[in-house]
């Protein structure tokens, strides 16, 4: 029985969101799933061989606003997208690499083939 004056509203509990993870899985993750009170993310970036590597995982609530803002980093091509709408929502995220700077070209934009 509740004591007089005690609030009957449930204490807000952190929402637990499940996300797909790849290369960012905690050691105790099972089936490439992690849990967070924050956001799921998917990121694409050039690795040190010029390959467009995709990674994914969980971001804690604290600081995730900044991390999901995708602030451009000089000399690094990468893009991140975040979501919270449902479990494993980051399976459906498709961040795209930012365009190359003009200085990377000799004679105008590159046409593939």
């Amino acid at each position: 029985k509740k004591e007089d004056g005690e609030s009957t509203a449930p204490t807000p509990r952190p929402k637990v969101l499940r996300c797909k993870c790849h290369h960012h899985c905690p050691e105790d993750s099972v089936n490439n799933i992690c849990s967070t009170d924050g956001y799921c993310f998917t990121m694409i970036e050039e690795d040190d061989s010029g390959l467009p590597v995709v990674t994914s995982g969980c971001l804690g609530l604290e600081g995730s606003d900044f991390q999901c803002r995708d602030t451009p980093i000089p000399h690094q091509r990468r893009s991140i997208e975040c979501c919270t709408e449902r479990n494993e929502c980051n399976k459906d995220l498709h961040p795209t690499l930012p365009p190359l700077k003009n200085r990377d070209f000799v004679d105008g934009p590159i046409h593939h083939r």
Epitope: H22, H23, N32, I44, E46, D48, S49, G50, L51, P52, V53, V54, T55, S56, R77, H94, T96, L97, L100, R103, D104, F105, V106, D107, I110, H112, R113
Partner: antibody, heavy 116, light 107 residues
Amino acid sequence: QVQLQQPGAELVKPGASVKLSCKASGYTFTTYWMHWVKQRPGRGLEWIGRIDPNSGGTKYNEKFKSKATLTVDKPSSTACMQLSSLTSEDSAVYYCASRRGDIDVWGTGTTVTVSS
Amino acid sequence: DIVMTQSQKFMSTSVGDRVSVTCKASQNVGTNVFWYQQKPGQSPKALIYAASYRYSGVPDRFTGSGSGTDFTLTISNVQSEDLADYFCQQYDSYPLTFGDGTKLELR
């Protein structure tokens, strides 16, 4: 337009070495990574390794570490791969491929034939 | 090393058909997979990166899908110029490895 030009063919004797070239044009050579791939008929494609033309840093497939040496000549925008102690197993088409995230352009390929 | 298996060495199709080329990785590679097309006497041409991203200039009848260990390249409304070898390649871990290829031929 990005282009990677490779000599069409090289005929070499068993036990000898050969240096394959890949001349890049149409982009700033030092801002793309160069990969090398081997293709033998009916044996598929094998990744040999890659070089960062800016730093000269390399990463190799362990299988090719004692076979291939990757280098670059920045002034001529040319990547090179030296193959040593050649045997018939090294007879193949060798491709260079320039990569930068969502850009991936392959060279014309050099056919290496090892024969006495 | 990660093994990429393309179990179908040959696939028969007709112009206008829809065809799916499959590739299976021996371990989880996320979505870090390329698809290439190679015509006889030519160098490979990149079609798809990161499993589902189409390279610039690639017709939208080419679609990549899959994640983890199972990947598919679907060609809808096959054209005669699509008859070629198709290779998958994983780039999730070194050494980068390729599938043995699937040859698409006319029925």
